[in-house]
Structures are given as structure tokens and as C-alpha cells.
Amino acid sequence: EPPTACREKQYLINSQCCSLCQPGQKLVSDCTEFTETECLPCGESEFLDTWNRETHCHQHKYCDPNLGLRVQQKGTSETDTICTCEEGWHCTSEACESCVLHRSCSPGFGVKQIATGVSDTICEPCPVGFFSNVSSAFEKCHPWTSCETKDLVVQQAGTNKTDVVCGPQDRLR
């Protein structure tokens, strides 16, 4: 009685269960009653990452330096190449097909989370008591200077973009 379903890592063809090709190999010929499935290893710069009956291997992803990409992990016959972005850039999508420059946080905003190869800079507004006077992809909001600890007094109040200005205390004559 010909099978209607096959075991895991097999496929049904011509009323026969044939073995799938293992990861890293492609199908050359289906099995017959005389021979098992014929598979061949994927070539250089090719891969297949599952048990399969593919007649062609997939090409490894190309990490195009013109798009700011570089190789994070070299592909094998069983895995695709993983790309990431050059320093100062991050991927525009999960697939990391291109890169954009990390965003800088404007004055009045500080870096909450530094960018990685796959995520952009996260900025946050500087709360009261903190400031940022530069546009930066690394600088956090800095606390205002504490004039009191220096035996000074506030001469000019701080903002989210500027530090306080301290000055000497008025002395009674």
C-alpha cells in the first residue's frame, strides 16, 4: 500500500517516501525504488538552512560596504551571512539591508540609549536639573553644577540647554 504521509525529514513523491536533503545540501535526484535521494553540498557562498528538497542553494547575503554594511558573521553551507553596520551607523530594518547614520541628540536632549549596529540612538529630554548643550550621539544629560557645594551662589539659572552660572556670594561689609 503506497504511503499517504511520510516521517519527519522525508517527503512524498511518486507514492514513495524519500529522505529530505540535510541542511547544507541540495537535491539532485529524488529517491527511487533502487536508490535513496541524491544530494550534493552547496557551493562556495551558498547555503540551505533546513532539511529540504531544493534543487538550488541560496546565495549568501552580500554585505555591501557602499550601503555601510560589513560582515558580522560569515555564512556557512548551513547559515546565511549576517551583516551589521559600520561604526556610527545602524540597520534600517531587521534584515539589515542598508544602514543609516546614528541620530544625534540635539541640545536640550541627552542619550538615553546609545545606538548599536541594529538600533538607533534613543534620546530623552533633559529634565529639570539637567542639561545638554551639544548635539551628540553619546552624551547624556548632565546635572547642573551645584553652586552650594562650591560655596558659590547661582548667578544665572540653568535650562535644559545650559548649565547654571555660579558666582561668589555677596559679602556683608
Epitope: 539532485v28 535526484s29 527511487t32 525504488e33 533502487f34 536508490t35 535513496e36 541524491e38 550534493l40 534543487t55
Partner: antibody, heavy 113, light 107 residues
């Protein structure tokens, strides 16, 4: 009925190449792989490789890799086996075989200086 | 490569005898075991495939059995036309390999 008709006997010098043809009839040529098997005088059978006429995908016995090339011409339902850099121990009868069930009549290749 | 070992390498039996040829594979070859008959000066012919399936036109006195690594070809009642060399062959793992052959003669 299935028929595989091979080209005639060949005598070759060491270092030369030989190309054996195998014309198939009586079935759909692209439905079956063509295997090639050889038999040295008084010896057993040795599988050389096979070709899938549907996609021209080839598998070779590593013993022959680099010296043997299998090809097909689907327009004439003909398979070919070329063996290069012939040596005296390549003297044998070469068979084409339709996926290991029906055999050609064999082609005798003699390698001698 | 998988080694296919046949025994005996030759045998002589009388017409009507039951003849058994064994074939042992160096590793598991699943069900992909074929038997061929080659008469003197002739082309090999497929007798049995997938361990026990008779090829079309093969007399029912031929049968195959076994599993994994150990296989048997049996001729239930030897006939004069069965004089030949018999080869087992595995089709499970590349490269496909043949046994060394068993030459069957009539006493």
C-alpha cells in the same frame, strides 16, 4: 520496450580521452537518471556516477572525479560519458544503465600503448 | 565508501537444489539493496530490488530477504539457466557499491 544502444568499441593510448554514447528509447528519457558502471576484464562492477537528464545534475564517484564527465542531449535522448587521462587500468566494458534497472549492451574500451 | 561483502565467492550445486547467497554491508543501507545476474559473456540484469521485490520477467524461484546490513538471495530450485555470477549492490549511500560477486555453477 526499453532499449539503450551504446557506441562501438574503442582502442586508446594512455593519456588520451574517450567519449561513449548511449541512445535511449522506449521510455521518457527525462524521467530516469542514467548511471554509468564499468567492469574490468574478469572483475566485478564499479559505479562511476549518474546524471539526472531533467536538470543535468551529476553525481560522480570520487574515484573518477576530475577525469569523468557525464552529459545528456535531451533532444536526441542520448547520454554521454567522457573519461580523460586514460590509463591501462581503465581497460573495461563501460555500461550505461537506466537508473540501475535496464543496461546498455556495453562498450569495450581498451587502453594500450 | 560502503563495503559490500558477498559469500560464498563461488558455489557449485545440483539442479533442483536450494541455493543461498549472502551479502553484508559495512553499514546500514536501509532497504536499498539490489541483486543482479550476469550470465557468462552477457550484460548484467536486474533480478531483485528494494531487498525483496522481483523485477519484471524474473522467475518466482528467485527471492530476496534481509534488513539493515545482512541480506540474502535465494534460488529455491536451481535451474541450468541460472548459471551466472550474482552481484548485490547498495543504493543507499553515495557512491553506490557492488559486492564482489558469487559465481554459481551446476555440479
Amino acid at each position: 520496450q526499453v532499449q539503450l544502444v551504446q557506441s562501438g568499441a574503442e582502442v586508446k593510448k594512455p593519456g588520451a580521452s574517450v567519449k561513449v554514447s548511449c541512445k535511449a528509447s522506449g521510455y521518457t528519457f527525462t524521467d530516469y537518471n542514467m548511471d554509468w558502471v564499468r567492469q574490468a576484464p574478469g572483475q566485478g562492477l564499479e559505479w562511476m556516477g549518474d546524471i539526472n537528464p531533467k536538470n543535468a545534475g551529476t553525481i560522480y564517484n570520487l574515484k573518477f572525479k576530475g577525469r569523468v564527465t557525464l552529459t545528456v542531449d535531451t533532444s536526441t535522448s542520448t547520454a554521454y560519458m567522457e573519461l580523460r587521462s586514460l590509463r591501462s587500468d581503465d581497460t573495461a566494458v563501460y555500461y550505461c544503465v537506466r537508473r540501475l534497472d535496464y543496461w546498455g549492451q556495453g562498450t569495450t574500451v581498451t587502453v594500450s600503448s | 565508501d560502503i563495503q559490500m561483502t558477498q559469500s560464498p565467492s563461488s558455489l557449485s550445486a545440483s539442479v533442483g537444489d536450494r541455493v543461498t547467497i549472502t551479502c553484508r554491508a559495512s553499514q546500514d543501507i536501509s532497504n536499498y539493496l539490489n541483486w543482479y545476474q550476469q550470465k557468462p559473456g552477457k550484460v548484467p540484469k536486474l533480478l531483485i530490488y528494494y531487498i525483496s521485490r522481483l523485477h519484471s520477467g524474473v522467475p518466482s524461484r528467485f527471492s530476496g530477504s534481509g534488513s539493515g546490513t545482512d541480506f540474502t538471495l535465494t534460488i529455491s530450485s536451481l535451474q541450468p539457466e541460472d548459471v551466472a555470477t550474482y552481484y548485490c549492490q547498495q543504493g543507499n549511500t553515495l557512491p553506490y557499491t557492488f559486492g564482489g560477486g558469487t559465481k554459481v555453477e551446476i555440479k
